[in-house]
Interface confidence: low
Amino acid sequence: FPQDRPFEDTCHGNPSHYYDKAVRRCCYRCPMGLFPTQQCPQRPTDCRKQCEPDYYLDEADRCTACVTCSRDDLVEKTPCAWNSSRVCECRPGMFCSTSAVNSCARCFFHSVCPAGMIVKFPGTAQKNTVCEPASPGVSPACASPENCKEPSSGTIPQAKPTPVSPATSSASTMPVRGGTRLAQEAASKLTRAPDSPSSVGRPSSDPGLSPTQPCPEGSGDCRKQCEPDYYLDEAGRCTACVSCSRDDLVEKTPCAWNSSRTCECRPGMICATSATNSCARCVPYPICAAETVTKPQDMAEKDTTFEAPPLGTQPDCNPTPENGEAPASTSPTQSLLVDSQASKTLPIPTSAPVALSSTGKPVLDAG
């Protein structure tokens, strides 16, 4: 459509729009008190309310306070985001006996398996330890990190929690951030596998591993305990969590007992070169520069790939798909990715500032 590349004078006389030279087109001007959900809003619903810090925009478009995890038996599972509350869960060594919206009203210590019983399923933040009778001939010691048995009493005392560094938390699901409410609800039902081992991990004989007994007295939790700022990788090694100390990075998820800290580019920047659990190179956003061209494609799955324009062509931030159709996807490897999903007449405004995660997806965080 030739009309799809308006010149600067296209917007003149229309006070509800302004011309953005960076993207070379007319953009909708968000009314006072509303903030754009994307670089160049296209319609009124690309604007949204901005909530105060520690508040999120609920499904009725109300700013609602995020729950707090300040109780000492709770840890933050997912942070307060622009469209979802903070989620708290019981800290390691405890499980939730009375649930509450986005949190837990009562946490209890995991039970310890009595004499003659071993751990069938270790306790989690949601469930107590499940015990089963020990097989004949099995020593009453810890046979493996998963199978512990206490040699003492026949009752089930409350377990002592495994000591946990204040720097760690028991994050068992990826934070649900950005996207639409429906996508968020779907994502919140998904749990993630532990992060892949880092290539810069320490071997378990290094000081990353605390010299605690494999099965602390009175505990039904047999996992290793790593030093602060280390996590237990899939191979059972204590591995250093990545650091977000670079100026252009912020922490996305904390260093947890079984997963690395993850870093993302700070608000106003986007990841140009990704790295395991972090970003190797952040560049300023917006990114429609003279040497890049946007290729519209399957916005939902592959997002928008920015790549060098073909030789001899004039760079253009917004090529129109020929015949109204998006071209086939190109490999997004080390490309700049901007998620365009949440912009179709959506009743899900997003808050400024726009942080962009290490996957390149906008993380629109009010928390």
């Epitope: 459509f1 009309q3 799809d4 308006p6 229309n14 509800s16 729009h17 993207v23 087109r25 007319c26 909708y28 994307q38 670089q39 160049c40 296209q42 319609r43 009124p44 619903t45 996207g179 639409t180 429906l182 996508a183 779907a186 946007t294 519209p296 494609q297 399957d298 916005m299 939902a300 799955e301 928008t304 917004n318 129109t320 798909p321 109204g324 159709e325 998006a326 086939a328 365009s340 999903q341 949440a342 912009s343 179709k344 007449t345 959506l346 009743p347």
Partner: antibody
Amino acid sequence: EVQLVESGGGLVQPGGSLRLSCAASGFTFSSYYMHWVRQAPGKGLEWVSAISWSGGSTYYADSVKGRFTISRDNSKNTLYLQMNSLRAEDTAVYYCARDRFMPFIPNTLGFDVWGQGTLVTVSS
Amino acid sequence: DIQMTQSPSSLSASVGDRVTITCQASQDISNYLNWYQQKPGKAPKLLIYVASNLETGVPSRFSGSGSGTDFTFTISSLQPEDIATYYCQQDADVPLTFGQGTKVEIK
């Protein structure tokens, strides 16, 4: 040739269910928002539901919310509308339509491709 | 919800006449308005998108204008094949809504 073909319509009793399908061909299905629009006999057009590229976002008219579910299978280039708790007022020709909306590309609006429609009759 | 009010509901004009249909939105929708033509027993066809842009392959006698809440659709010279019902549709917010339609007949 860009084409949408609806199927699955028919006669159903009040309270019953139907599943409509819309087979897309001739374009990159996963790159487009898709919609269902209906038209009761002798009446105007009524938007029913929409779904985003990946299916991550869905939208419904108040009249069908909680009863109808829109979904898509991009691997099969097919759009669906699961209709439960059908009422007499749901009787209509149901059209699937392609929405060429693409964010960051101005003036890409409008249902530019429509199917031929499938008739759903809810009657006892 | 955004209500779309179309007028007139029907009109009769002679071949060659200039025909004008108006559409009013209950709130500001900027220029997010489309116009469709529907012939009996057929699916609707997009004619005008984003208030004033002519869809590819649509004759230039069809045009659209307007912004905010008031929009106009014009057939500059009515032809026999233009007998149909015309609908406006707002694309500014969900639920998307259509006008009630204008039936155009030849005198």
